[in-house]
Interface confidence: low
């Protein structure tokens, strides 16, 4: 039977004053000689020679300083041998515990921790969790770390609290404002022995970035603007409207969207935002007509690309800026309106018979122009003549079979109105359907029942039946078609400048 005792030893100090640290004895020693032997870590395994035994008495001594963080306890395997080296007892496991001393400071997992938190966050919102460890004995005061914020920059007023036990950093209040401070730096101390004065400490830095929320309402630099724009023109940079917003530059919280509240019902204007400068560019995308409108009032508002933060939702009131637009008159001169007309010529019309009138309109007055002269432009088969003063179109001769066949029953020519003062020429398109001559020797073509109308932009064909009854003076029928867009689009009027 073994008789044993073992005392604990303390790390980091000379334990020899406690020797023997342990003692073993076998009751077999009563009637025979016993030799005691030990083995294990600290004896015959590294680190060697920490424990030695008096083989006769069984006293075990400790010979050197031990480190609990390396070896928290030693297991000494003990044997009692007779003179022939045979075991007298079952081998014994003797456990020697190493007592902890506070010889290790806390260690933060990072020298600098990075965190981020939205401005205006509620008090007690988690920002980050610091992590620190202490190599001393777990669940012991020597390894119990208490956290404390020791410095905050900017230091105006404390904004963060730390849970002394868990290292959680939370907001102290709901006053974080990125527009005031975009970043905070904290110094945090971790002290073992639960923050006791006799504890060891370490420090770390925490950089906390304050994230932007859309808590600033954008506003336009001016509350009113006055501009002038010429009629009939497009403008890609009519006015620059600068928006001020205190949120984070180039973010959706800062980027503005300027929109029309009223006044742009005709969609004449667009506002394009420059996302680098937060400047809105007012553009004219549809020409204005002075004759229809000499001035107009635009009302514009501004919001952000991103939704407003709930903290300012209730404060947002749509604040309109006014743009007073004056439309300037441009001397437009004459154009053919419509740009194309369709007439009918019948087989019994002869030389100098009137086909119809094609008169240029003065856009500034809306009346027939009095300042132009008319000439034929393209005149296939030399079919028509025009009165230079009145714009009256007449047949030069009775239509011949050769002319009819050449034209295939359809004529498309042009008339020019020339304003010598404005140095402007306008082109109109003349379409003529030449009617069948029945059994007359001069035609061998079927009756034609089609009209071509040309707006100057596209050609469309529409089927129409004609009344072929005529009169001797003006036997033509006129069909006209307005240009499709109805706007004063100079392209569709085929206006040319220069002599």
């Amino acid at each position: 039977e073994w008789i044993k005792f073992a005392a604990a030893c303390r790390e980091g100090e000379d334990n020899s004053k406690r020797n023997p640290i342990a003692k073993i004895h076998s009751d077999c020693a009563a009637n025979q000689q016993v030799t005691y032997r030990i083995s294990g870590v600290g004896i015959d395994q590294p680190p060697y020679g920490i424990f030695v035994i008096n083989q006769k008495t069984g006293e075990i001594n400790i010979t050197s300083i031990v480190d609990r963080e390396v070896t928290p306890f030693f297991i000494i395997y003990c044997r009692a041998l007779n003179s022939m080296g045979q075991d007298l007892e079952r081998p014994l496991e003797l456990r020697v515990r190493v007592l902890d001393i506070n010889d290790n400071p806390p260690v933060f997992s990072m020298a600098t921790f990075a965190g981020q938190i939205e401005e205006n966050s509620n008090a007690n919102t988690l920002v980050m969790i610091l992590n620190a460890t202490d190599a001393d004995e777990p669940n012991n005061l020597n390894s119990k770390i208490a956290f404390k914020i020791i410095r905050q920059e900017p230091s105006d007023s404390p904004m963060f609290i730390i849970n002394r036990n868990t290292g959680e950093i939370r907001t102290m209040n709901n006053f974080l404002d990125r527009e005031q401070y975009g970043q905070y730096a904290l110094a945090v101390r971790g002290s073992d022995r639960d923050g006791g004065a006799d504890g060891m400490s370490a420090e770390c830095e925490c950089n906390i970035k304050i994230l932007d929320v859309n808590d600033n309402i954008p506003y336009m630099e001016q509350s009113s603007y006055t501009i002038e724009i010429q009629e009939n023109t497009l403008n890609s940079n009519l006015l620059e409207i600068r928006v001020i917003d205190l949120d984070e530059e180039f973010s959706a919280n800062w980027m503005a969207v300027i929109f029309f509240i009223s006044g742009n019902e005709g969609n004449w204007f667009e506002i394009e935002m420059n996302e680098r400068t937060n400047v809105g560019i007012l553009k004219v995308v549809k020409p204005l007509d002075y004759e229809a409108m000499q001035s107009l009032q635009l009302s514009i508002g501004v919001r952000n690309k991103a939704e407003f933060h709930h903290s300012i939702m209730s404060q947002y009131k749509l604040k309109a800026s006014a743009i007073s637009v004056t439309v300037l008159n441009v001397i437009e001169g004459p154009v053919f309106r419509p740009g194309s007309k369709t007439y009918v010529v019948t087989g019994n019309m002869g030389s100098n018979d009137k086909v119809g009138d094609f008169v240029a309109t003065d856009l500034d007055t809306g009346r027939p122009s009095t300042t132009v002269r008319y000439v034929m432009g393209n005149n296939p088969a030399d079919l028509l003549a025009v009165d230079s003063r009145t714009g009256k179109l007449t047949l030069k001769n009775k239509v011949t079979k050769e002319q009819y066949n050449m034209l295939g029953g359809k004529y498309q020519g042009t008339i020019l109105s020339i304003d010598d003062n404005l140095q402007r020429t306008c082109t109109g398109t003349i379409n003529i359907n030449i009617q069948s001559f029945g059994n007359d020797d001069r035609t061998n073509t079927e009756p034609n029942t089609k009209i071509t109308t040309n707006t100057g932009r596209q050609e469309s064909t529409s089927s129409t039946n004609y009344d072929t009854s005529t009169t001797s003076t003006d036997s033509s029928q006129v069909y006209s078609s307005e240009p499709g867009n109805g706007a004063k689009d100079l392209l569709s009027d085929n206006v040319h400048f220069g002599p």
């Epitope: 970035k209 530059e249 180039f250 996302e275 680098r276 690309k305």
Partner: antibody
Framework: QVQLVQSGAEVKKPGALVKVSCKAS????????ITWVRQAPGQGLEWMGW????????KYAQKLQGRVTMTTDTPTNTVYMELRSLRSDDTAVYYC???????????WGQGTLVTVSS | ELVLTQSPDSLSVSLGERATINCKSS????????????LSWYQQKPGQPPKLIMN???IRASGVPDRFSGSGSGTDFTLTINSLQAEDVAIYYC?????????FGGGTKVEIK
């Protein structure tokens, strides 16, 4: 005026690393990002990645992940692109370019030829 | 990965004539939230870095002549050079920045006939 000036040509052995610099001037350095694009001889353009100078965020092309690192040095207005474990098919002209985000790169460096050859 | 396919590979156009380059995306680059097409066009001349000529698919970059125009939306885009000039000889690339990895088209080489 805005300028991006890149470091000079490099000749490297396979397995080595190369670090190309891109020095910016003429604008507020931290208001923009820098993207890196490379072009193998006679080939098209290949996007490598992008770094936000403002906050250091990076996005790398998947095929280069683990081999490429982009960093900034704000005091010197310089961006660096490091490519490790070089292979012969990394031979290319490497360009840096300025842009707010991942597109619309309005100013470019002159390019740096990196030749990988044993 | 979003693939951009340019056509034609090369284009030979007389001076003063129109050049048209197409770029087709394997999926849309139109971002619904802001209704913008995340597509740029770049011009690259031999020995030079690329030059931005068009962003958001149709907005000319500053200093780019108005003979260059961009159009299209979603997956199909076109770069048009009206009245080709000698200095327009280059390779033109479309590039999407809708999703990573950012990708370029294979390029279209424009030459004088």
């Amino acid at each position: 005026q805005v300028q991006l000036v890149q470091s000079g040509a490099e000749v490297k052995k396979p397995g080595a690393l190369v670090k190309v610099s891109c020095k910016a001037s003429g604008y507020t350095f931290t208001n923009y990002g820098i993207t890196w694009v490379r072009q193998a001889p006679g080939q098209g353009l290949e996007w490598m990645g992008w770094i936000s100078v403002y906050n250091g965020d990076t996005k790398y092309a998947q095929k280069l992940q683990g081999r490429v690192t982009m960093t900034t040095d704000t005091p010197t207005n310089t961006v660096y692109m490091e490519l490790r474990s070089l292979r012969s098919d990394d031979t290319a002209v490497y360009y840096c370019a300025r842009g707010y985000g991942s597109g619309n790169w309005d100013y470019w460096g002159q390019g740096t030829l990196v030749t990988v050859s044993s | 990965e979003l693939v951009l396919t340019q056509s034609p590979d090369s284009l030979s156009v007389s001076l003063g004539e129109r050049a048209t380059i197409n770029c087709k995306s394997s999926q849309t680059v139109l971002y619904n939230s802001d209704n913008k097409n995340y597509l740029s066009w770049y011009q690259q001349k031999p020995g030079q870095p690329p030059k931005l000529i068009m962003n958001w698919a149709s907005i000319r970059a500053s200093g780019v002549p108005d003979r260059f125009s961009g159009s299209g939306s979603g997956t199909d885009f076109t770069l048009t050079i009206n009245s080709l000039q000698a200095e327009d000889v280059a390779i033109y690339y479309c590039q999407q920045y809708y999703s990573t990895p950012l990708t370029f088209g294979g390029g279209t080489k424009v030459e004088i006939k």
